[in-house]
């Protein structure tokens, strides 16, 4: 029970990241104009992965989007591959969990198989929430560094005179979303790791003891059981001791209560 | 056809109130930042308050803060002005203009409304 | 906030003649975001409530002439009339539209001979 549960909220878990990791990744406020000198501006600027938007205190939005590839900055063209890397990712991992769940049973798929897919589909998951953590990470120290540039020559002295603003650029809520949905899918990615800890056949030998309170008499069994593969009802290999773990599809072979030892 | 058509101005003594209307027709109300701005006689434009759409944001010149406040009732299609504390300085024809939707312009003007404020 | 000067205070002109008047702001109103500059452009003829010529400093309002042309980047603007018509005498305003509280300039008087 708990593996599958593990396993479920895994994939559950992930499926949340990786639909935040598509959502950061679409999303045109990762950086947003710092409103600390101008807070009642009439024009507020914010940009994304993939256009620069503009919008006026009319109501009016206007978004452009980056026609040039080689003409954007290397660290811009590095998150937007991070990004579209961690997405590519999370879906391959998404597609063979669904297919590694335990609660969902094609053919006679054996649990060795399922607990290799949740490991595959873990690892990507890890993986892809890193990727997002880290492209939106360079995207934040990229701001960060623009950021105290632009405060450094703030205001540009024109005949003494004029002042010339330039626009700073803060943390946008894409870049939020971006950290959190990549902790998701990373956790979600160890969450499936462990959950294939629990799906993997049992292969040591435990010394068992089973007590049937109909009986008089004590059946010691020694010697291991190996798990059924079968979704049957296989009842002559049943495994005595299961180190703790039970799951709903485990089928109860004798009507008798047991302890196990 | 847009039309504004201000009203609610007068004679007010210093110290005075009053609320100042403005009743917008010939396009979708709610989807428009409404100003009021004002002239006094025989000077420049001079702009008063802004209002969003949706009532917020709203923004005040620092000569009206405090005083004034502009307000909007979609369903009705109306934008106020109420003026508090006046002074003999709030003197002037009063506009509301419809905020163009790009470009950050007014490009729609009442005829105005005269205030008038003296002991 | 940010003070608009306009010059000259008057002009006067005969008809079909160039007018050209300037509006300066004391900081600039290019937003890099979108590459435009915020400033506006009014006509306010006697009598009357103002009338929008041009908005992002050069882009004319429909039903507006073509005698009219804005012009400028960042704090330096012109307004052109190509050929001044007996209907043009108005007081022309700039405006700042780029943040608040908006501003304008104390206007330019355009008088015909």
């Known amino acids: 029970m708990a593996v599958t549960a593990c396993q479920g909220l895994g994939f559950v878990v992930s499926l949340i990241g990786i639909a935040g990791i598509i959502a950061a990744t679409c999303m045109d406020q990762w950086s947003t104009q710092d409103l600390y000198n101008n807070p009642v501006t009439a024009v507020f600027n914010y940009q994304g992965l993939w256009r620069s938007c503009v919008r006026e205190s009319s109501g009016f939005t206007e978004c452009r989007g980056y026609f040039t590839l080689l003409g954007l900055p290397a660290m811009l063209q590095a998150v937007r591959a991070l990004m579209i890397v961690g997405i590519v990712l999370g879906a391959i991992g998404l597609l063979v969990s669904i297919f590694a769940l335990k609660c969902i049973r094609i053919g006679s798929m054996e649990d060795s198989a399922k607990a290799n897919m949740t490991l595959t589909s873990g690892i990507m998951f890890i993986v892809s929430g890193l990727c997002a953590i880290a492209g939106v990470s360079v995207f934040a120290n990229m701001l960060v560094t623009n950021f105290w540039m632009s405060t450094a020559n703030m205001y540009t002295g024109m005949g003494g005179m004029v002042q010339t603003v330039q626009t700073r650029y803060t943390f946008g809520a894409a870049l939020f979303v971006g950290w959190v949905a990549g902790g998701l899918t990373l956790i979600g990615g160890v969450m499936m790791c462990i959950a294939c800890r629990g799906l993997a056949p049992e292969e040591t030998n435990y010394k068992a003891v089973s007590y049937h309170a109909s009986g008089h008499s004590v059946a010691y069994k020694p010697g291991g059981f190996k798990a059924s593969t079968g979704f049957g009802s296989n009842t002559k290999n049943k495994k005595i001791y299961d180190g703790g773990a039970r799951t709903e599809d485990e089928v109860q072979s004798y009507p008798s209560k047991h302890d196990y030892v | 056809d847009v039309q504004l058509v201000e009203s609610g101005g007068g004679l007010l003594q210093p110290g005075g109130s009053r609320k100042l209307s403005c009743a917008a027709s010939?396009?979708?109300?709610?989807?428009?930042?409404m100003h009021w701005f004002r002239q006094a006689p025989e000077k420049g434009l001079e702009w008063v308050a802004f209002?969003?759409?949706?009532?917020?944001?709203?923004y005040y010149a620092d000569t009206v803060k405090g005083r004034f406040t502009i307000s909007r009732d979609n369903p009705t299609n109306t934008l106020f002005l109420q003026m508090t504390s006046l002074r003999s300085e709030d003197t002037a024809m009063y506009y509301c203009?419809?905020?163009?939707?790009?470009?950050?312009?007014?490009?729609?003007w009442g005829q105005g409304t005269s205030v008038t404020v003296s002991s | 906030d940010i003070v608009m000067t306009q010059s000259p205070s008057s002009l006067t002109v005969t008809a079909r003649e160039k007018v050209t008047m300037s509006c300066k702001s004391s900081?600039?109103?290019?937003?890099?975001?979108?590459?435009?500059?915020?400033l506006t452009w009014y006509q306010q003829k006697p009598g009357q409530p103002p009338k929008l010529l041009i908005y992002?400093?050069?882009t004319r309002e429909s039903g507006v002439p073509d005698r009219f042309t804005g012009s400028g980047s960042g704090t330096d603007f012109t307004l052109t009339i190509r050929s001044v018509q007996a209907e043009d005498l108005a007081v022309y305003y700039c405006?700042?539209?780029?943040?608040?509280?908006?501003?304008l300039g104390s206007g330019t008087k355009l008088e015909i001979k």
């Open positions: 203009a419809r905020f163009r939707r790009g470009g950050n312009a007014m490009d729609y």
């Open positions: 010939g396009f979708s109300f709610s989807n428009f930042g």
């Open positions: 209002i969003s759409g949706g009532s917020s944001p709203i």
């Open positions: 900081q600039s109103l290019f937003n890099s975001g979108n590459q435009r500059n915020y």
């Open positions: 992002w400093a050069s």
């Open positions: 405006q700042n539209s780029y943040s608040y509280p908006f501003t």
